[in-house]
């Protein structure tokens, strides 16, 4: 609450995180022609990524694009990409939705579809939608230990959310444990109202908020956490502003001494860790 | 403006953003001793990497060390690196600007030069000038989409950059369509008073700064995004403090049972969004 | 120092870090069986990875698991997860400590020891400790430049810690050369009170504060860093809250056409560079 | 699926020419050829993108093998001259996205160089 006689400061923060869990995927793979159902398990170092602190990613869905070649081929027949001549295809014009730079040639993309060649990483990536239900829907159990270290320098304070006291093997909830800081991700989702299930196939940003409100007079000291959760992308946005959360990344190889890459589309959400407050002081 | 009856309170902000565009990039490659021109595609997985919410990078320029091997070998003949004889090489001396650790011989290097042989990822890294006009130079024509989403906890309210009434085709002007959140990367420079094309060859850092002033009272309600843009790195900086924006990664492998690696330098543009302002209610 | 009758506005900041410095590393190398002294040179490349610009980290010691495949094997003999019969281990159930899911089978791991069989990455992590000392100790001698670029945009000021009078090859000492933004790894930890070589063990968090504390107006105008350095994670904090600062990442690669990676175990020092203050003018 | 049919496989001597032949039941981006050796993995000799741009050659037969196709008739020759007994294998047609990618495969042809 507002001491209006208190000098305001603003925290200053720093945050680690640390995922825990593992999942099993099961999906469609295809070899030499021939498509059987694989299964494969995921541990944090498949799904998450080094990121700073106050933001962590964990992959919850993901399209791949195998043994990815630099060299000509016929661009995907996504609506509006299909040609009957050469006409249609202008050289050296990059689409902002294609994936390559046009040679000027109309090609066959398969028995019944023309579309234009293109110079790009072949076969371009498929415009197919994320798997549903998401690969890596058991994400939803993971759970993540935020570490918050904080700092009031002109009050000369510091202090941490994770007190000695503290039992390591606690679970975050609101109402039972509102000071635990390991959090079930799906307990954050169903807490911001939201369905982990339904935004692990496109994925999302989530918002965990902490708050500290901090009073530093010694006779009436009190400074502990505040743990809040609203998810930060807009799942009502329009197609073209590119709704979830979503990014590409390769894996490069040679094989045979040719230069490739597998193309990883990988889903998730980003977590973001948004610290705030003030500490207060006679 | 100042309305000092209100209560002021700072944002809070998340950022997500999308790099959209292709490069061809054209350069000289030796392959068995023959030197030809070669074409290369790079997408998104290509230039950029997977990297926090109010940061991204973009490549526009690199230098290539292929093939290294953990072993012995002169190094590189940078200026006042030579060496005639024996005693200017100190076994286990470590020279900072040296990218190994002196085995103590002075050694030949090619058939004019000698300098002292190091354990290191060898051959050493080429000390040589970034690519003039940059590699992918053409990233000029990338777009980014920001999506801003900002909250101002004590007043409870939140909002976004990006409404649903607007256009995913537009492209951002400060005159035409300052609310688009669409930027071509070229016109955020021209924006800034800078040269995309010079900028691209050694990097640099380009701020995005996007101002909330929010007037949340309900009778004069306002709260839209500003957007400008400057550039954070100095260009007229002393080489001895690292001018530009560049950093080494580097693709490990193996070949006849032998870890090599090929190190890249990687010159580009960091893309900062720096999101501050506040939101004022009576 | 507080002047009231100033307009007090919080800085804008962006951070650029560069690391410099060769590690040699020396450890026991298994092949074919044979165990043996092996030696090798880490430069930035290898212990650094491109993170935003106000953190970086620093690997100072690591545990590998290399050649591992997903397939079914013993899980790691930890304290508590050894089994005598098939009764002991839950088909489908993921220990939160283990690396896989149980298969509902009571196998042989050694000689004398049986443990739950497990889907996944196999051979699974030994908990073995992180070699101690650090395999990366020498990072202590390692330099980074921090470049930092502030603004105080409502009064339009601009300004960085970097000035053109600065010599590069200067190292900053608290009373010798307080401005100097190179600063040697190991003289930060002294700084802070901190011994490195046993942070770099299991890895630690470091803070780099950097404090501008501006008088913006033309007859009294100050506006220059003071930086200052303290631990950011609980060197005191409980096992389960995972002490130190580790993470995990996989190089992935094929082999005779199955599907392999290295998992690294990596430790560190994740710096966080902490930019804070205010410009004043009236 | 694309159906392929091979033809114009045979007995030659070292040094000899043979021409291969290759009609597929649809047209398609690419069409190339593979070949596999007793005891030996399948490898890539010859591939060509639509109106025969571009070509790829495996190493060991640059400057000896010639690939075109004709696209009207969704057919591929493979042109070989200074036969070698190391060519010696069966050697398959082959349709894909792209001279590096192939998804189909006809049933084979045999190529035996005699020395």
């Known amino acids: 609450s507002d001491k209006l006689y208190q000098r305001k400061e603003p925290v200053i923060s720093s945050v680690h995180t640390k995922v825990k869990g593992i999942a099993e995927v099961t999906e469609n793979v295809t070899e030499g022609g021939v498509t059987k159902l694989g299964h494969s398990i995921f541990d944090t170092a498949d799904y998450t990524f080094p990121l700073q602190g106050n933001s962590f990613f964990v992959m919850t869905n993901y399209v791949k694009s195998e043994g990815q070649v630099q060299t000509l081929c016929p661009e995907y027949p996504r609506r509006g990409a299909q040609c009957s001549s050469d006409r249609r295809c202008k050289k050296g014009w990059m689409d902002p939705q294609s994936k390559g730079i046009q040679t000027g040639r109309c090609v066959p993309y398969d028995k019944t579809r023309k579309t234009c060649e293109v110079s790009a990483w072949c076969p371009t990536e498929e415009e197919k939608e994320a798997p549903r239900p998401a690969l890596l829907r058991s994400a939803e159990n993971f759970t993540v230990l935020i570490k918050n270290n904080i700092h009031f320098p002109g009050h000369n304070y510091t202090t941490r959310n994770i007190l000695p006291t503290m039992n390591g093997s606690c679970t975050f909830h609101k109402t039972w444990d509102p000071q635990c800081s390991i959090f079930r991700l799906g307990d954050i989702f169903q807490e911001a109202g939201e369905n982990f299930t339904e935004v692990a196939v496109q994925g999302g940003i989530m918002g965990i908020e902490i708050y500290w409100d901090c009073n530093l007079d010694s006779w009436s000291h009190h400074c502990r956490p505040r743990y809040s959760f609203r998810r930060l992308d807009d799942k009502n946005m329009d197609e073209s502003f590119v709704p979830g959360y979503n990014f590409r990344y390769a894996k490069y190889y040679k094989e045979n001494n040719v230069e490739k890459r597998t193309l990883i589309k990988a889903f998730g959400i980003r977590f973001d860790i948004l610290v705030f407050g003030t500490g207060g002081k006679f | 403006s100042d309305k000092l009856y209100q209560r002021k309170e700072p944002v809070i902000s998340s950022v997500h953003t999308k790099v959209k565009g292709i490069a061809e990039v054209t350069e000289n490659v030796t392959e068995g001793g023959v030197t030809k021109l070669g074409h290369s595609i790079f997408d998104t997985a290509d230039y950029t990497f997977p990297l926090q919410g109010n940061s991204f990078f973009v490549m526009t320029n690199y230098v290539k060390s292929e093939g290294q091997v953990q072993t012995l070998c002169p190094e590189y003949p940078r200026r006042g690196a030579q060496c005639s004889s024996d005693r200017r090489c100190k076994k286990g001396w470590m020279d900072p600007q040296s990218k190994g650790i002196q085995t103590g011989r002075c050694v030949p290097y090619d058939k004019t030069r000698k300098t002292c042989e190091v354990s290191a990822w060898c051959p050493t890294e080429e000390e040589k000038e970034a690519p003039r006009p940059a590699l992918l130079r053409s990233a000029e024509n990338f777009t980014v989409l920001i999506k801003n989403n900002i909250h101002f906890p004590g007043h409870n309210y939140t909002t976004r950059n990006i409404l649903p009434t607007m256009n995913g085709s537009c492209t951002f002007h400060k005159t035409w369509d300052p609310q688009c959140s669409i930027f071509r990367l070229g016109d955020i420079f021209q924006e800034a008073g800078e040269n995309f094309t010079e900028v691209a060859v050694q990097g640099g850092i380009m701020g995005i700064e996007i101002y909330w002033d929010c007037n949340l009272d309900s009778w004069s309600h306002h709260c839209r995004p500003r957007y400008s843009f400057r550039r954070l790195d100095d260009k007229n900086m002393d080489e001895s403090f690292v001018p530009g924006y560049n950093f080494r990664y580097a693709k490990y492998y193996k070949e006849n049972n032998v870890e090599k690696r090929t190190l890249i330098k990687a010159f580009g543009i960091r893309f900062d969004i720096l999101v501050f302002g506040t939101g004022g209610k009576f | 120092s507080d002047k009231l009758y100033q307009r007090k506005e919080p800085v804008i900041s962006s951070v650029h870090t560069k690391v410099k410095g060769i590690a040699e590393v020396t450890e026991n190398v298994t092949e074919g069986g044979v165990t043996k002294l092996g030696h090798s040179i880490f430069d930035t490349a290898d212990y650094t990875f491109p993170l935003q610009g106000n953190s970086f980290f620093v690997m100072t010691n690591y545990v590998k698991s290399e050649g591992q495949v997903q397939t079914l094997c013993p899980e790691y003999p930890r304290r508590g997860a050894q089994c005598s019969s098939d009764r002991r281990c839950k088909k489908g159930w993921m220990d939160p400590q283990s690396k896989g899911i149980q298969t509902g089978r009571c196998v042989p791991y050694d000689k004398t020891r049986k443990t739950c069989e497990v889907s996944a990455w196999c051979p699974t992590e030994e908990e073995k400790e992180a070699p101690r000392p650090a395999l990366l100790r020498s990072a202590e001698n390692f330099t980074v430049l921090i470049k930092n670029n502030i603004h105080f945009p409502g009064h339009n000021y601009t300004t960085r810690n970097i000035l053109p009078t600065m010599n590069g090859s200067c190292t900053f000492h608290k009373t010798w050369d307080p401005q100097c933004s190179i600063f040697r790894l190991g003289d930060i930890f002294q700084e802070a009170g901190e011994n490195f070589t046993e942070v770099a063990v299991q890895g630690g968090i470091m803070g780099i504060e950097i404090y501008w504390d501006c008088n913006l107006d033309s007859w009294s105008h100050h506006c220059r860093p003071r930086y200052s350095f303290r631990r950011l994670d609980d060197k005191n904090m409980d096992e389960s809250f995972v002490p130190g600062y580790n993470f995990r990442y996989a190089k992935y690669y094929k082999e005779n056409n199955v599907e392999k990676r290295t998992l690294i175990k990596a430790f560190g020092i994740r710096f966080d560079i902490l930019v804070f203050g205010t410009g004043g003018k009236f | 699926e694309v159906q392929l049919v091979e033809s114009g496989g045979g007995l030659v001597q070292a040094g000899g020419s043979l021409r291969l032949s290759c009609a597929a039941s649809?047209?398609?981006?690419?069409m190339g050829w593979f070949r596999q050796a007793p005891g030996k993995e399948r490898e890539f000799v010859a591939g060509s993108g639509w109106d025969g741009i571009p070509t790829r050659y495996a190493d060991s037969v640059k400057g000896r093998f010639t690939i075109s196709r004709d696209n009207a008739k969704n057919t591929v020759s493979l042109q070989m001259s200074g036969l070698k007994p190391e060519d010696t294998a069966i050697y398959y047609c082959a349709t894909g996205t792209s001279v590096y990618h192939y998804q189909y495969w006809g049933q084979g042809t045999q190529v035996t160089v005699s020395s």
């Open positions: 649809e047209r398609t981006y690419s």
